[in-house]
């Protein structure tokens, strides 16, 4: 009699995640009787994937009825596949016995599976920097495959040279993972930026995926402090302006300070944006002359963003001749430099 | 599933000529969707895409002479001053549902004559 | 770009032969490989995807295997209706773009 086949026409069988898979398997004879099951894997460390007889196979389904008499098809039907479920899947007869005796397996059909990669997740650094020094930032996209995969950086619409990109693992395996490192150079301007990286895949539908983080949550812009002089009023008040400029984040907190005392205190709150994202703030202070005998150093001193404190002073003269009402005066900047990096 | 191309017809040098390519059976906001030609006894070649957001890439050799577009349900191929080396049967053609590296759906393709 | 050589250009032969067509990259393309039939006043129409994928319907005499920069399309035992024209496609992942083989020309002998 005709030996007995077990044919699997397909060597190789490719899916995307979340689909279905059809393994097609049929024999050549009803002979010798005995049942047929499917595996993942050869060897003795194979995996049972189906047997009609007895077990619980949640997604394998036969695509024909098995109990029907004379079959011949033991074709399955794998639903909602993910990359774990790639690998070589062989059917396989049986002699029926007490155990039943494996007779013959099929030739194997390789199960490719393609899954598109996760969208990009980008972070940046933990700590806010200033204009000039160099912040990482991180992209990450999971589960795709194959391992063939593009990533660019962009900066507001440029392509980012100084990136170093990573794909794990290095060998063989059911889906892969991408990370990749841009560093970029902060400038004053950067308030309103953003980077993008971007990521392309043979599954994804000529679109590549996008992830975006914005300058804003990793930028510093120090503030420029000016105190100036407004005018001496018939009163013997003097007004003396405090004028904090280019600054972000708006998180601020400024004290005046009248020959080192505690004069008042304010924090900035609902500021209106400059166009390039910053912002600037003018607080007033009006000293009465007349009830001082000396000179008055005033000191406007700024917290910006929890760094420490910059200060600018400027001294009130106090005179038998009081300035023209309308006169401008400059501060002398007993403080540090005016355009502070910290 | 189903593509048919239109618009093909015979025109002067330096004419333009915008074809069409009209799917049924799935929609063009889920796939890839491709322009190639023929010229008559040479092999096939690659004009460009349109990604399922209406992104189009295009073949170097392109140069800005070809734009491709597209509507609800159709794909379109606009041909600036055609030249006679432009004659060719022109295909449209769907990438497969795994990944944008081949195309399983092919229009019957439509006939360019450019000749004076 | 990448370029596509196919070999043979055409060949000649008999209903039943085996017939291998070759198609090699200019750079290594991975498995992104695809094998396309075409008749006279035809359409291309799919056979091979990911340099060994029978797409769906194709009768099983047709297979593919390579990958890299070397590939090959084998039809087992040539039927009647498998005499017409054979195209590789390529796509590269980092450019995005498509190239063809120049084509195999399968005629009766």
């Known amino acids: 009699e005709e030996e007995l086949q077990v044919i699997q026409p397909e060597k190789s069988v490719s899916v995307a995640a979340g689909d279905s898979a059809t393994l097609n398997c049929t024999v050549s004879s009803l002979i010798p009787v005995g049942p047929i099951q499917w595996f993942r894997g050869a060897g003795p460390g194979r995996e049972l994937i189906y047997n009609l007889k007895e077990g619980h196979f949640p997604r394998v389904t036969p695509v024909s009825d098995p109990t029907k008499r004379n079959n011949m098809d033991f074709s399955i039907r794998i639903s909602n596949i993910t990359p774990a479920d790639a690998g070589t899947y062989y059917c396989v007869k049986f002699r029926k016995g007490s155990p039943d005796v494996e007779l013959k397996s099929g030739a194997g059909t390789e199960l490719s599976v393609r899954a598109k990669p996760s969208a990009p997740v980008v972070s940046g650094p933990a700590v806010r920097a200033t204009a000039e020094h160099t912040v990482s930032f991180t992209c990450e996209s999971h589960g795709f495959s194959p391992r063939d995969i593009t990533l660019k950086w962009f900066k507001n619409g440029n392509e980012l040279s100084d990136v170093q990109t990573n794909v794990d693992p290095a060998g063989k395996s059911v889906s892969y993972s991408i990370r990749s490192t841009a560093r970029v150079v902060l400038t004053r301007r950067d308030v309103h930026s953003q980077v993008i990286c971007e990521v392309a895949h043979v599954t994804l539908q000529g679109d590549p995926l996008r992830g975006t983080a914005n300058l804003s949550e990793a930028i510093r812009v120090p503030p420029f402090l000016e105190v100036t002089q407004q005018s001496m009023r018939a009163d013997n008040q003097v007004n003396v302006t405090c004028q904090v400029t280019k600054f972000y984040p708006q998180r601020l907190q400024l004290t005046w300070l009248e020959n080192g005392n505690v004069s008042r205190t304010e924090m900035a709150s609902a500021l209106p944006e400059n166009k390039d994202g910053t912002y600037n703030w003018t607080s007033w202070l009006l000293v009465n002359v007349s009830a001082h005998r000396d000179d008055v150093k005033l000191t406007c001193q700024v917290e910006h963003d929890g760094q420490p404190a910059v200060n600018k002073s400027f001294s009130v003269k106090v005179s038998a001749h009081p300035k023209e009402q309308g006169s401008n005066t400059a501060a002398e900047n007993t403080g540090t430099n005016e355009r502070n990096i910290y | 599933v189903q593509l048919v191309e239109s618009g093909g017809r015979l025109v002067q040098p330096g004419t333009p000529l915008t074809l069409s390519c009209t799917v049924s059976?799935?929609?063009?906001?889920?796939?890839?969707m491709g322009w190639f030609r023929q010229a008559p006894g040479k092999g096939l070649e690659y004009i460009g895409i349109i990604s399922s957001s209406g992104s189009p890439y295009y073949a170097s050799w392109v140069n800005g002479r070809f734009t491709i577009s597209k509507t609800s349900t159709t794909m379109d191929l606009k041909m600036n001053s055609l030249r006679s080396e432009d004659t060719a049967t022109y295909f449209c053609?769907?990438?497969?549902?795994?990944?944008?590296?081949?195309?399983?759906?092919w229009g019957p393709g439509t006939l360019v004559t450019v000749s004076s | 770009d990448i370029q596509m050589t196919q070999s043979p250009s055409s060949l000649s032969a008999s209903v039943g032969d085996r017939v291998t067509i070759t198609c090699r990259a200019s750079?290594?393309?991975?498995?992104?490989l695809a094998w396309y039939q075409q008749k006279p006043g035809k359409a291309p129409k799919l056979l091979i995807y990911?340099?060994?994928f029978l797409y769906s319907g194709v009768p099983s005499r047709f297979s593919g295997s390579g990958s890299g920069t070397d590939f090959t399309l084998t039809i087992s035992s040539l039927q009647p209706e498998d005499f017409a024209t054979y195209y590789c496609?390529?796509?590269?992942?980092?450019?995005?773009?498509?190239?063809f083989g120049q084509g195999t020309k399968v005629e009766i002998k």
């Open positions: 990911s340099a060994s």
């Open positions: 053609a769907r990438v497969g549902p795994l990944g944008v590296d081949y195309f399983n759906i």
């Open positions: 750079q290594s393309i991975n498995s992104y």
């Open positions: 059976g799935f929609s063009l906001s889920s796939y890839v």
């Open positions: 496609q390529s796509w590269h992942y980092i450019s995005r773009s498509y190239t």
